[in-house]
């Protein structure tokens, strides 16, 4: 069971990143699915290595004081959402903006029907060029 | 099937990074090989988690306007080369240069004879000290 | 065999990061253990994908000239310690400090009784908020 999906620009104002089965994507079988273009949902309980990579372009003056944060989050049926992993990068002083990349990854137990998704502080800063931003998992 | 190879400084002017089976490297068996010191080639079709880490040292004034970009690329026999993953980091203002690290990783389907390699915008900026820059894969 | 442990603030002045089985941690079975809150020790020989993520907050003026470096290290019974992976990030000019994240990961052969741990140049700069700093491995 494995998946690798590709970032998709979105007009939605949500902080949850959007993904698509496009480009050189992976969706090994129907035991993992991309739901509503925003979350990877697994049918089987087990240990999964889950990862995300986010490239963004921001400028210190044009952004809030707070850093750019990417969060890998988990939603299991009947449970509260929780943050699995987070990474933070202070905005660049480069103009008009400076690109930076964040990589998240870790091993987590997922229940049947559990979904994982990626949140960022400012989705408008995310880079969607080929290979820059992606999200995936593999069952151990 | 797994491999982990270590960066090697090169006098070549190519943007493709050079690697060696040295230090604490891994080459599990002959189903994955390091070819010409530049690409990992697999003999078996399947899903692989492929990763690369690149540490580099650059300075904004001494570098081009463009960010430092590391790309994980795929070459399958008779197919076009393609970018699987990319990461970008704006150059530091630290002098003489500021170090930064990039990590790339994802799950991809590889065909028999497929090769993966790592491209960077400026190989002269890459750090080759112990553990700083490496490249590997594992078959799921 | 898999583990994922969560960073823990420590009053110790050691450069070795401290970890705990808390939050959404993983410890698949007793073939991998967290020892003294500082190292993951495996009982079985084999290939392991080992990873660490460290988020830190630093300021160029308040820090040494040297960059912030995170190192993934190996200690095998009767062998010298060795660095497996390192990543470096120059300190931010943001005030009071600028957050940055480092991700390390690679495939390594571990012997029975081998331990892996994470070293940083300045543990006081490490961010311990939910999901920011973690450490784990999985057996291939």
């Amino acid at each position: 069971i494995a998946a690798h999906v590709i970032s998709e620009a979105s007009s939605k104002t949500t902080s949850v990143l959007q993904w698509a089965e496009k480009g050189y994507y992976t969706m090994s079988n129907n035991l993992v699915t991309l739901e509503n273009g925003k979350q990877l949902t697994v049918k089987r309980q087990g240990l999964y290595y889950i990862y995300a990579q986010v490239t963004f372009c921001s400028n210190r003056e044009a952004s809030s004081q707070a850093p750019f944060i990417a969060s890998l989050c988990l939603k299991s049926p009947g449970r509260f959402e929780r943050i699995l992993l987070r990474a933070a990068n202070t905005h660049s002083s480069a103009k008009p903006c400076g690109q930076q990349s964040i990589h998240l990854g870790g091993v987590f137990e997922l229940q049947p029907g559990a979904s994982v998704f990626v949140n960022v502080t400012d989705p408008s800063q995310v880079s969607h060029g080929t290979g820059f931003t992606s999200f995936g998992l593999l069952k151990l | 099937i797994a491999a982990h190879v270590i960066s090697e400084a090169s006098s070549k002017t190519t943007s493709v990074l050079q690697w060696a089976e040295k230090g604490y490297y891994t080459m599990s068996n002959n189903l994955v090989t390091l070819e010409n010191g530049k690409q990992l080639t697999v003999k078996r079709q399947g899903l692989y988690y492929i990763y690369a880490q690149v540490t580099f040292c650059s300075n904004r004034e001494a570098s081009s306007q463009a960010p430092f970009i590391a790309s994980l690329c795929l070459k399958s026999p008779g197919r076009f080369e393609r970018i699987l993953l990319r990461a970008a980091n704006t150059h530091s203002s630290a002098k003489p240069c500021g170090q930064q690290s990039i990590h790339l990783g994802g799950v991809f389907e590889l065909q028999p004879g497929a090769s993966v390699f790592v491209n960077v915008t400026d190989p002269s900026q890459v750090s080759h000290g112990t553990g700083f820059t490496s490249f590997g894969l594992l078959k799921l | 065999i898999a583990a994922h442990v969560i960073s823990e603030a420590s009053s110790k002045t050691t450069s070795v990061l401290q970890w705990a089985e808390k939050g959404y941690y993983t410890m698949s079975n007793n073939l991998v253990t967290l020892e003294n809150g500082k190292q993951l020790t495996v009982k079985r020989q084999g290939l392991y994908y080992i990873y660490a993520q460290v988020t830190f907050c630093s300021n160029r003026e308040a820090s040494s000239q040297a960059p912030f470096i995170a190192s993934l290290c190996l200690k095998s019974p009767g062998r010298f310690e060795r660095i497996l992976l390192r990543a470096a990030n120059t300190h931010s000019s943001a005030k009071p400090c600028g957050q940055q994240s480092i991700h390390l990961g690679g495939v390594f052969e571990l012997q029975p009784g081998a331990s892996v741990f994470v070293n940083v140049t300045d543990p006081s700069q490490v961010s311990h908020g939910t999901g920011f700093t973690s450490f784990g491995l999985l057996k291939l």
Epitope: K22, G23, Y24, G129, T130 | S15, P77, G78, R79, F80, E81, I83, N119 | -
Partner: antibody
Framework: EVPLVESGGGLVQPGRSMKLSCVAS????????MAWVRQAPKKGLEWVAS????????YYGDSVKGRFTVSRDIAKSTLYLQMHSLKSEDTAIYYC?????????????WGQGVMVTVS | DIQMTQSPTSLSASLGETVSIECLAG??????LAWYQQKSGGSPQLLIY???RLQDGVPSRFSGSGSGTRYSLKISGMRPEDEADYFC?????????FGSGTKLELK
């Protein structure tokens, strides 16, 4: 709006050279492979050449290898085809096309085409 | 080079009729195949990719099927605007090759 517009065609004598251009708009040019495909009068389609994202890799059909060169200018979002030693059998409509980003690299956008007559 | 043999060379169909065009590859191309439509005086347009996936904006009366070396394009219910030349193409390996085309006319 057509995102690919070719120019530079016309009549040329055998053995001479000609350069075609294709200006792209509406997408990030460096994120896609680009290609030239031709169609001789009343004939089928023939792939001529393709070029990678930023131009580091080029690929050619057997009939033009060594005579034609594909290149691109990222800053100008322009694709080029430099044709040397032209032959009468190179007479065709030349289309600029974008490869999609799927594993198959299909042609998802085509220009209107430009006529090259070698006579 | 992978040879692509397309048939028939031409056919005519009545309004509402179902039409099939075949493409035979010289070797297994693992579904890495596209179908294009080219109307008179126009540029080719992508209809089907990956053997059976419909390109965005293409009417659902077009469908693709097949595997290995044999592929087909089906038009379920011929319409006047479907009068065109149709080409298959393999991108499994370069050099990329096209079928010789099928001219579809309205009866």
């Amino acid at each position: 709006e057509v995102p690919l517009v070719e120019s530079g065609g016309g009549l040329v004598q055998p053995g001479r050279s000609m350069k075609l251009s294709c200006v792209a708009s509406g997408f990030t040019f460096s994120d896609y492979y680009m290609a030239w495909v031709r169609q001789a009068p009343k004939k089928g389609l023939e792939w001529v050449a393709s070029i990678s994202y930023e131009g580091s890799s080029t690929y050619y059909g057997d009939s033009v290898k060594g005579r034609f060169t594909v290149s691109r200018d990222i800053a100008k979002s322009t694709l080029y085809l430099q044709m040397h030693s032209l032959k009468s059998e190179d007479t065709a409509i030349y289309y600029c096309a974008r490869h999609d980003d799927s594993p198959g690299y299909y042609f998802d956008y085509w220009g209107q085409g430009v006529m090259v007559t070698v006579s | 080079d992978i040879q692509m043999t397309q048939s028939p060379t031409s056919l005519s169909a009545s309004l509402g009729e179902t039409v099939s065009i075949e493409c035979l590859a010289g070797e297994d191309i693992s579904n890495v195949l596209a179908w294009y439509q080219q109307k008179s005086g126009g540029s080719p347009q992508l209809l089907i990719y990956a053997a059976n996936r419909l390109q965005d904006g293409v009417p659902s009366r077009f469908s693709g099927s097949g595997s290995g070396t044999r592929y087909s394009l089906k038009i379920s219910g011929m319409r006047p605007e479907d009068e065109a030349d149709y080409f298959c193409q393999q991108t499994f390996r370069y050099p990329l090759t096209f079928g010789s085309g099928t001219k579809l006319e309205l009866k």
